[in-house]
Interface confidence: low
């Protein structure tokens, strides 16, 4: 009897997701079975299914079976949260690029490499043909997209609607181009999903046909993701378990990228004189072992045969025969010289103190000329002398060049958060340094509060309770979604970048978040011809102890009557006391039959001696936060709109004057809210927004 | 699980030894081998996965093999010397999806190789 | 890749406590895949604990395991007449990418 085999590595799985259709025309087909692999089976078999099914869910509860002739990307289709249902995608359908000689591509690309848009198979204009779908069942030759039914060399491609051309392939990229891997690959999260000789993967959340320690659970950070290919274990590249029974695991091909900097997740805190942590990111000169014998050369196998070689372990810095850390080791060691001894630990070498020495500044740090040189983040500061061009372009006068030696950290641009510097990473352009103000220095940054001396104008889930329905312009308000569920509130302050709340990440994967725009509905319920549904490319931190974020997302909002920014205050301007500012927000209102609608609170401003004072002198308020109290008792932002806004008008302008962040109760009467002053960090958000790339639409 | 085969040998014959269980699907369990010289420790020679696919330490490698059938282990030692002589032991190694240790949690009772001249 | 077992033998008396260290050569061993195996005279080891500190089925608590990376404990509390055996550790490293065990010297523990 032949092994059928198993398809689910086929398919893409979204945890805890399932998908509901919208528009009623879209069939579905149920049936009671025992496993997700059944399901699997079926649907790429399309045995029994009155249509091509591109995706099913699993109902672990039920143990049934939805298969789909959709999948989340088609429209009349949206996502939902649910424990049990798992769905699982067939890859075909959504990846953007093409395996071999792209036979099983069935993306939506539909435009041939010259630009000419391709002529739907299922029409004889303006070239007949006999590439009908009825003759090539299987091969998805739907609409007018690229296909490649007969696996010609080339590609997939399509009759063209230019009837001087007849046909012509499409310019899809091999997979093995689009991905690359920085380093060893370690923190590589792509979708190479076959290694170098072609055997498809096994999925990470299966034992079979190779049992494995490598358990999704186990190990959430290393991005164990369906049958992808990863470096979970300091390997000199991503590999996987093959679907091979005699061939237990292989390398992938995925190239090293163009720009081979270091991702901005789990970069090591490069030290040169002492070990910070496991000292993975020691790059000194000690090269004896704590005993004074010498180490031997990483690129020398003699006298110890080794595979710790730097062509193995690039991004590890194996240079000489200097002692370093490159698999996680408990400290930096080396390979020794003398044959009898294969390793050591280099227990000489000094644990680092973390607060720097006496190393702090005074005011804003304008004048720090310490000698850090490194971000709070770990990166290594770039030299100032390379990066002059970009700082003129965000500072409008002369920068001290004599203050700006080497690559310390300094703050040429009067930035009110500290010494910062560039780091040469062009995903992360520049950073604060880990320098504190100094012990009882309390010269403010910015200087009375209290007193309107700027104009603000220019020419547990917090939620809001007990307020009334909105539904006027407010369409830079922001959904974040985590695992497909409302988390938390946003405020869109450019077409890329949301403003929200450092507690709303409650997991490092981007992929767990999206952020939905042109919303009324927490649900997107009567939104679907106005919603955006963007992915989060990035995240920003705010300044230490500023609870902010910036979010960047993957592509640029597009901006229209549902959605739209919101401006921001000018730097360090108060808003006068008793100013009418209301506050947004989804989640738990008070309301038993709660509605799921954006409710809107309104607020009035309060000064800070006098909102210490309601907090019954238990909080000292200090420059970078602002308050404001409910005009209704009992009304005001709640555990669950973290992130959202605080928005107040001045001269017919609204503005984001105030983050909602947890931590200082929930809607209790005669306690005012106290809220992150978006004024004092203004300068920051306008500095990230000028230095950090964004996608183009 | 009850390992049998071990006996006298002189060196250089070869011998095999057969686990045979009983209540364990072997297409469901990874199975190994371990071994006891007289008065030593515990010394870890390889395991066979549900698949058949068999994974060897250093020092075993190429002078023993192991295989199976649907109810049974075997390890062949293909070239012994007096330095093989030990009880072998035959284990189940732990299957809860949850861990990630290869824990051996059920043991045969051994069997005795000598191998002498 | 060598396990050390440290002290042996260790005596301990009844109701008394025992403890035994387990150190890696290297901490290239998947963190907290360890074992701990309790063998008496004439007889198989019995799994005692997996996954660093797990407690196998049937096995009273008062044997209780810890540690990560190199280091790792048994630790023994209330000791009994029957605890008198050899205790074994055993960890996992990466061959590749396959998985190889190996196992510690042994630690007798003698109870008075």
């Known amino acids: 009897q032949r092994k059928r085999r198993n398809t689910i590595h086929e398919f893409k799985k979204s945890a805890k997701t399932t998908l509901i259709k919208i528009d009623p025309a879209l069939k579905i087909k149920t049936k009671k079975v025992n496993t997700a692999d059944q399901c699997a089976n079926r649907c790429t078999r399309n045995k029994g299914l009155p249509f091509t099914c591109k995706a099913f869910v699993f109902d672990k509860a039920r143990k049934q079976c939805l298969w789909f002739p959709f999948n989340s990307m088609s429209s009349g289709v949206k996502k939902e949260f649910g424990h049990e249902f798992d769905l699982y995608e067939n890859k075909d359908y959504i990846r953007n690029c093409i395996i071999g000689k792209g036979r099983s591509y069935k993306g939506t690309v539909s435009i041939t490499k010259s630009g000419i848009k391709c002529q739907p198979w299922s029409s004889m204009i303006p070239h007949e043909h006999s590439f009908l779908p009825s003759s090539y069942r299987g091969k998805d030759l739907q609409e007018n997209y690229c296909r490649n039914p007969r696996g010609e060399e080339g590609g997939p491609w399509c009759f063209t609607s230019n009837p001087e051309v007849r046909y012509e392939v499409c310019d899809i990229p091999q997979c093995s181009e689009v991905e690359c891997m920085t380093c060893n690959g370690e923190s590589y999260r792509g979708l190479m999903d076959h290694t170098e000789s072609g055997k498809i993967c096994q999925r990470w959340d299966h034992q079979t046909p190779h049992r494995h320690k490598f358990l999704p659970e186990r190990y959430p950070d290393k991005g164990f993701d369906d049958n992808y290919c990863r470096n979970p274990d300091g390997q000199p590249r991503p590999w996987c378990y093959t679907l091979d029974p005699h061939t237990r695991w292989e390398y992938c091909a995925i190239k090293t990228c163009a720009d081979n900097t270091m991702n901005d997740t789990d970069v090591p805190l490069e030290t040169t004189e002492c070990i910070q942590g496991q000292g993975e990111g020691y790059r000194g000169t000690v090269n004896t072992i704590w005993n004074g014998i010498p180490c031997q050369r990483w690129d020398s196998q003699y006298p110890h045969e080794h595979d710790m070689t730097p062509e193995n372990f690039k991004c590890k810095d194996l240079r000489e025969n200097y002692c370093r850390n490159p698999d996680g080791s408990e400290s930096p060691w080396c390979f020794t010289t003398d044959p009898n001894i294969r390793v050591g630990y280099c227990s000489q070498i000094p644990n680092c103190d973390m607060s720097h020495g006496q190393d702090c500044y005074r005011g804003n740090g304008k004048n720090y000329m310490g000698n850090l040189s490194q971000t709070r983040s770990g990166l290594t500061c770039s030299m100032w002398d390379k990066n002059m061009e970009d700082l003129h372009r965000h500072i409008f006068w002369e920068p001290d060049a004599s203050k700006l030696n080497e690559n310390y950290c300094r703050n040429p641009d009067d930035d009110a958060h500290g010494p910062w510097c560039y780091t040469g990473n062009p995903l992360i352009p520049w950073d604060y340094c880990p320098i504190s103000r100094c012990e009882g220095d309390t010269t403010p940054t910015i200087v009375n509060l209290d007193h309107p001396v700027i104009s603000c104008a220019k020419t547990k889930q917090l939620r809001v309770v007990n307020g009334i329905p909105t539904r006027t312009n407010i369409g830079w308000m922001v959904s974040l979604r985590y695992r497909n569920k409302h988390i938390c509130g946003g405020s869109l302050i450019k077409e890329s970048w949301v403003l929200t709340a450092r507690q709303c990440f409650p997991s490092r994967d981007l992929k767990d978040y999206e952020a939905w725009l042109g919303i009324h509905d927490v649900h997107g319920r009567g939104d679907e011809k106005c919603k955006q549904v963007l992915n989060v490319s990035q995240l920003v931190y705010g300044p230490e102890g500023s609870d902010l974020v910036l979010m960047k997302l993957a592509r640029p909002a597009v901006l229209d009557d549902f959605v739209s920014t919101i401006d921001l205050p000018n730097y360090g301007c108060t808003i006068p006391e008793k100013t009418s500012c209301s506050v947004y927000g989804w989640g738990y209102t008070g309301l038993i039959n709660y509605d799921g609608l954006l409710r809107v609170a309104h607020l009035y401003i309060m000064g800070n001696e006098k909102c210490s004072q309601h907090h019954r002198g238990k909080v000292t308020l200090n420059e970078s936060e602002i308050c404001a109290g409910a005009e209704k008792i009992g009304s005001g932002p709640c555990e669950g709109d973290y992130g959202g806004p605080l928005v107040c008008e001045q001269h017919k302008m609204r503005m984001v004057l105030g983050v909602i962040v947890p931590g200082r109760g929930c809607a209790i009467p005669n306690r005012p809210g106290i809220f992150v002053r978006v004024a004092y960090y203004a300068k920051w958000i306008h500095k990230i927004i000028l230095t950090y790339k964004v996608p183009q639409s | 699980v009850e390992e049998s085969g071990g006996r006298l040998v002189p060196p250089g014959t070869p011998l095999t030894l057969t686990c045979t269980v009983s209540?364990?699907?072997?297409?469901?369990?990874?199975m190994g081998w371990v071994r006891q010289a007289p008065g030593k420790g515990l010394e870890y020679i390889g395991m066979?996965?549900?698949?058949?696919s068999t994974y060897y330490a250093d020092w075993a490698k190429g002078r023993l093999t192991i295989s199976k059938t649907p109810t049974t282990v075997d390890l062949e030692i293909t070239s012994p010397t007096t330095e093989d002589t030990a009880t072998y032991f035959c284990?189940?190694?732990?299957?809860?999806?949850?861990?990630?240790?290869?824990?051996?949690?059920?043991w045969g009772q051994g069997t005795l190789v000598t191998v002498s001249s | 890749q060598v396990l050390t077992q440290t002290p042996s033998p260790v005596s301990a008396a009844v109701g008394g406590t025992v403890t035994i260290n387990c150190q890696a050569s290297?901490?290239?061993?998947?963190?907290?895949?360890f074992s701990w195996y309790q063998q008496k005279p004439g007889q198989p080891p019995k799994l005692l604990i997996y996954?660093?500190?797990t407690l196998a089925s049937g096995v009273p608590s008062r044997f209780k395991g810890s540690g990560s990376g190199t280091q790792f404990t048994l630790t023994i509390s209330g000791v009994q007449c029957g605890d008198a055996a050899t205790y074994y550790c055993?960890?996992?490293?990466?061959?590749?990418?396959?998985?190889?065990?190996?196992f510690g010297g042994g630690t007798e523990v003698v109870v008075k």
């Open positions: 290297q901490s290239f061993y998947n963190n907290g895949a």
């Open positions: 055993q960890g996992e490293f990466s061959c590749g990418s396959a998985d190889c065990v190996a």
């Open positions: 066979i996965d549900v698949s058949g």
């Open positions: 209540g364990i699907d072997l297409s469901s369990y990874a």
């Open positions: 284990a189940r190694l732990i299957d809860e999806r949850s861990t990630y240790s290869y824990a051996f949690d059920l």
């Open positions: 996954d660093a500190s």
